[in-house]
Interface confidence: low
């Protein structure tokens, strides 16, 4: 009696069970009563990642440099290319179909978290006692110079954008 279900890694066709093609191979001919399933390996730039009966392999995803992407992991006959953003960019979506440049933190703000391949730079305002005088995607807020530790007097207080300005101690306080 013809089978109604087949074992794992088999498929039912013409009332008989045929072997699926292994990952990295595509189906050319179904099996017959006297021949095994005929499979062929995927070509360069193609892949199939499961036991299958596909007649065409899938194309490797193209990591388009014009969209800011690069290959993080080259695809094989059983895996797809993995695209990530080039340095200095992050994904515009979870699928990472394109990338945009990282944002910089303006003067008065420091980097709280450096951007990754999937998230943008996170900035924070410089708290009292700290400053940032540059626009940067990497620099944190830096502490004001403590003039007294250098034996100097503070001539101008620091702000969120500028460091304290030190000068010579007045010998006589008038």
């Amino acid at each position: 009696e013809p089978p109604t279900a087949c074992r794992e890694k088999q498929y039912l066709i013409n009332s008989q069970c045929c072997s699926l093609c292994q990952p990295g191979w595509k189906l050319v001919n179904d099996c017959t009563e006297v021949t095994e399933t005929e499979c062929l390996p995927c070509g360069k730039g193609e892949f199939l990642d499961t036991w299958n009966r596909e007649t065409h392999c899938h194309q490797h995803k193209y990591c388009d440099p014009n969209l800011g992407l690069r290959v993080q992991q080259e695809g094989t006959s059983v895996t797809d290319n993995i695209c990530v953003c080039k340095e200095g960019r992050h994904c515009t979506s979870k699928a990472c179909e394109s990338c945009v440049l990282y944002h910089s933190c303006s003067p008065g703000f420091g980097v709280k978290q450096i951007a990754t391949g999937v998230s943008d730079t996170i900035c924070e305002p410089c708290p009292v006692g700290f400053f940032s005088n540059v626009s940067s995607a990497f620099e944190k807020c830096r502490p004001w110079t403590r003039c007294e530790t250098k034996g100097l007097a503070e001539q101008q207080a620091g702000t969120d954008k500028t460091d304290a300005v030190c000068g010579p101690q007045n010998r006589l306080r008038l």
């Epitope: 360069k44 730039g45 992407l69 690069r70 993080q72």
Partner: antibody, heavy 120, light 112 residues
Framework: QVQLVESGGGVVQPGRSLRLSCAAS????????MHWVRQAPGKGLEWVAV????????YHADSVKGRFTISRDNSKITLYLQMNSLRTEDTAVYYC?????????????WGQGTLVTVSS | DIVMTQSPLSLTVTPGEPASISCRSS???????????LDWYLQKPGQSPQVLIS???NRASGVPDRFSGSGSGTDFTLKISRVEAEDVGVYYC?????????FGPGTKVDIR
């Protein structure tokens, strides 16, 4: 700027082993594939091996397959070529080179090379 | 393996004159993304190779615009519009279409 400095070359007898190193600087080493290419004295360039950025994929030329192994240590920012069962025909200058990636596949920056001489 | 051939194997050029080197591959280097995986390198005397052209026609950064690459499939050409004394050396084409990557035999360019 990108810099690649090979070391470990020298004179070695046939059948012996040698390990070449390539110290990288000036770029994010862990983001790039890396190659070894060799050049026998007075001859042309011969591609030897390539390794993907995180070591999952490596390919070797048939002439060295089973004898040479390309590897990398991203924490040390260094590329290696372990050469076993050396033959006289392996005598060459060995260059390490960075792969340009999807936008420029193939070696884009090259080191100055290290000479390996296999002789009895 | 893909076999690369070059012609001529030797070339002597007058400064200021154009020069052209041909490279052929035994299989197509055109990939489904529309790019040709063919690079050109120059190895100056006593130096390491340097990339001139990648993906058939993309000039590498810092390469003078007198160098240009063209062609598709199996036939490629490197042109130097006006040869200068510093252009002497051996020019290699290389296919990056599939492993093993393979180089052409090289074309030695001298100045007359």
């Amino acid at each position: 700027q990108v810099q690649l400095v090979e070391s470990g070359g020298g004179v070695v007898q046939p059948g012996r082993s040698l390990r070449l190193s390539c110290a990288a600087s000036g770029f994010t080493f862990s983001s790039y594939g890396m190659h070894w290419v060799r050049q026998a004295p007075g001859k042309g360039l011969e591609w030897v091996a390539v390794i993907s950025y995180e070591e999952s994929n490596r390919y070797h030329a048939d002439s060295v397959k089973g004898r040479f192994t390309i590897s990398r240590d991203n924490s040390k920012i260094t590329l290696y070529l372990q050469m076993n069962s050396l033959r006289t025909e392996d005598t060459a200058v060995y260059y390490c080179a960075r792969d340009g990636g999807i936008a420029a596949p193939g070696p884009d920056y090259w080191g100055q090379g290290t000479l390996v001489t296999v002789s009895s | 393996d893909i076999v690369m051939t070059q012609s001529p194997l030797s070339l002597t050029v007058t400064p200021g004159e154009p020069a052209s080197i041909s490279c052929r591959s035994s299989q197509s280097l055109l990939y489904s993304n529309g790019y040709n995986y063919l690079d050109w390198y120059l190895q100056k005397p006593g130096q390491s190779p340097q990339v001139l052209i990648s993906l058939g026609s993309n000039r590498a950064s810092g390469v003078p615009d007198r160098f240009s690459g063209s062609g598709s499939g199996t036939d490629f050409t490197l042109k130097i519009s006006r040869v200068e004394a510093e252009d002497v050396g051996v020019y290699y084409c290389m296919q990056a279409r599939q492993t093993p990557f393979t180089f052409g035999p090289g074309t030695k360019v001298d100045i007359r």
